[in-house]
Every structure is written in structure tokens, then in C-alpha cells.
């Protein structure tokens, strides 16, 4: 396990409707790891979210991070969010910790869609 997981993208863009209930999955993020088997298993988490509005859970089958709405959003109050996520290996033996000190991070821009005024296409 001498490879740490690295995000495929340094920046993601997601949208969420202000009518979405808490617990809604609003999108996925993905990292890759050149190891195999359990050494490639990873855990996603929030590194920065001042608003404490979002959470990330890990789908251990697909190794994707799922961005979850933790608190309902209100378009009039705030309609743009930015959060930073990080990813780490699930299993890291003590002797290989030196390869995993700096977790890979990605930034996620989240745009709230007004239920009264859907986005223009």
C-alpha cells in the first residue's frame, strides 16, 4: 500500500434543489488508487465546510464518495457553497504511513437551484 488515493478532478461542480430533503445524495466524487484489493479501499470525508450543510459518505463497493445534504438549503439565504473533501486509504500499515501523510483534496462548488426559478438552459 505505497500508493495513496488521488482525486480524479481537483474541482467538482454539483447542484442541489432547495426543495431537496436532508439525506439527499447530490452527486459523487471519485479518487483512484494504483494499489489493488483492500489496499485500494478508501474513505472520503469533509475537510472544510463552514456552513456544515454537507456530508460525504463512502460507497465501499464502487469506491466513490457520495455528497449528502446534511441540512436543508434556502436559496434566498445562500445559493452558492464551496466545500473541500479529502480521501485517505482505509487500511494503512504503520510502516507505510510516510506515504500517506498528505491526503489528496478536491474542491466542490455547489449551486443551489431556486424551486421558483429553475436554471436557464
Amino acid at each position: 500500500n505505497d500508493n495513496k488515493p488521488i482525486f480524479k478532478e481537483s474541482l467538482y461542480r454539483l447542484t442541489v434543489s432547495e426543495s431537496a430533503p436532508t439525506g439527499t445524495s447530490i452527486g459523487t466524487i471519485m479518487a483512484y488508487d494504483n494499489d489493488i484489493g483492500e489496499n485500494a479501499e478508501m474513505d472520503y470525508s469533509i475537510e472544510e465546510d463552514d456552513s456544515q450543510t454537507f456530508d460525504i459518505i463512502t460507497n465501499h463497493e464502487t469506491q466513490e464518495g457520495i455528497v449528502i445534504l446534511k441540512k436543508k438549503v434556502d436559496f434566498e439565504h445562500q445559493n452558492h457553497y464551496g466545500i473541500r473533501a479529502k480521501v485517505k486509504n482505509h487500511h494503512v500499515p504503520e510502516q507505510l504511513m510516510k506515504y500517506h501523510t498528505e491526503a489528496s483534496t478536491t474542491f466542490i462548488k455547489i449551486q443551489v437551484e431556486d424551486v421558483d426559478e429553475p436554471p436557464v438552459f
Epitope: E9, R13, S51, Q78, H80, G82, R84, K109
Partner: antibody, heavy 120, light 107 residues
Framework: QVQLQESGPGLVKPSETLSLTCTVS??????????WSWIRQPPGKGLEWIGY???????YYNPSLKSRVTISVDTSKNQFSLKLSSVTAADTAVYYC????????????WGQGTLVTVSS | EIVLTQSPGTLSLSPGERATLSCRAS???????LAWYQQKPGQAPRLLIY???SRATGIPDRFSGSGSGTDFTLTISRLEPEDFAVYYC????????FGPGTKVDIK
């Protein structure tokens, strides 16, 4: 380094439609996660955000201008455009195009701006 | 919409002095959603600070940002001749609005 360049007529008659184009170089307008905005500044005054577009065509406008604004994107030309209808002298301004940042919605890259005067 | 108020309107200082510029929001905003720009005559604004204390690429460390809630500050620790300009704050949490600007001119 991303560069943006505005182009379009410098003079528009009242009640007509102002049309400007922003050409992006040094990067792709289809880059994931970036939004492309128009911002204006009347002579001697402050800055006003007009609206933005994502490369997919999804746009969001300043509520105060929404009824008159259309922003579109042409990924094949690496350009995005602004149309502002029914203009008056109050729309005279320097118009800037801009791209947001890699860790937030602040405006990281700006064009040099183009002055549009509304006058008959 | 969130209205940003900047004070003072004009700040007259000499090179080498410390400049403290204030930006006040009409309601509370997260500190992660505030930026500062510098604009010189005939030029586009230039991003200085975002988040509200991260310096943009190439911005000297004499520029610093701080604040939370409704009150934010841009500090220029020691004014250089090239720092005399207009400074704008911007919030980007609830749509996008700019303050009216503070002009820093030479005393």
C-alpha cells in the same frame, strides 16, 4: 494562464440590444467546475455582477437584470456571449468577462474590459 | 440581497503607512465567501484575497484579510507606491455583490 478578451460594438442606441462576446484562451471553456461571468462598471462607479454560465449552458442571472439578460456559450469557439436588451443610458459601462476560482466563486481571471456607450 | 458597505470612502495615507479597510455585510455571511480586489484606473480589478484570508497567486504578503460574521477587514501592512488604488470587497454566498469601494490615495 487563462486569458479573456471582450469584443463587440462600443456604441449602442437606446432601446436596442447590447451584444458582447468573450473569447477564452489558455484554457478550455469546458473545464469542469468553472463558471464564466459578465460584470459591468458604469464610469466612475462600482462593480455589478450581471450573470454567469456553465459550459453545459446552465445560466444564472442577477435578479435585477434577469428580464433583459441572456448569456450563451459556444464551446466549439471557446467563447461566451452577453445580450442585454432594451438598453438605456444607465447601461453605459465598462463590461468585463471573468472566470471564477479553483477554490471558490470569487473572480480569479478578468478580461481587460470594453466600454459600451448607450447613446443615440 | 446582501448589501456590502465599505469604509472609509477615501483613505489618505503616505507610503510606508498601514492601511486598514473595512467591509460590512447587511447580514451574516460565512467568512469563506468573501473576497477583496484591487483596481487601478483604466484596468480590470485584480483578485487579492479570498476566503477571506487566502492570498491570490502573486499577491505580496503585506496584504492580509480577516473577519467573520458581518465585519471584514483588508490590511495593507506597509503601503508601497503601487498600492494606491480602489479596493472592493465582494461576497459570493448569496448571489454576487460588491461593496462600493474604498479609494486609497496619497496624502
Amino acid at each position: 494562464q487563462v486569458q479573456l478578451q471582450e469584443s463587440g460594438p462600443g456604441l449602442v442606441k437606446p432601446s436596442e440590444t447590447l451584444s458582447l462576446t468573450c473569447t477564452v484562451s489558455g484554457g478550455s471553456i469546458s473545464s469542469s467546475g468553472y463558471y464564466w461571468s459578465w460584470i459591468r462598471q458604469p464610469p466612475g462607479k462600482g462593480l455589478e455582477w450581471i450573470g454567469y454560465i456553465y459550459y453545459t449552458g446552465s445560466a444564472y442571472y442577477n435578479p435585477s437584470l434577469k428580464s433583459r439578460v441572456t448569456i450563451s456559450v459556444d464551446t466549439s469557439k471557446n467563447q461566451f456571449s452577453l445580450k442585454l436588451s432594451s438598453v438605456t443610458a444607465a447601461d453605459t459601462a465598462v463590461y468585463y468577462c471573468a472566470r471564477d476560482g479553483s477554490s471558490g466563486w470569487y473572480f480569479q481571471y478578468w478580461g481587460q474590459g470594453t466600454l459600451v456607450t448607450v447613446s443615440s | 440581497e446582501i448589501v456590502l458597505t465599505q469604509s472609509p470612502g477615501t483613505l489618505s495615507l503616505s507610503p510606508g503607512e498601514r492601511a486598514t479597510l473595512s467591509c460590512r455585510a447587511s447580514r451574516q455571511i460565512s467568512s469563506s465567501y468573501l473576497a477583496w480586489y484591487q483596481q487601478k484606473p483604466g484596468q480590470a480589478p485584480r483578485l487579492l484575497i479570498y476566503g477571506p484570508s487566502s492570498r491570490a497567486t502573486g499577491i505580496p504578503d503585506r496584504f492580509s484579510g480577516s473577519g467573520s460574521g458581518t465585519d471584514f477587514t483588508l490590511t495593507i501592512s506597509r503601503l508601497e507606491p503601487e498600492d494606491f488604488a480602489v479596493y472592493y470587497c465582494q461576497q459570493y454566498g448569496s448571489s454576487f455583490t460588491f461593496g462600493p469601494g474604498t479609494k486609497v490615495d496619497i496624502k
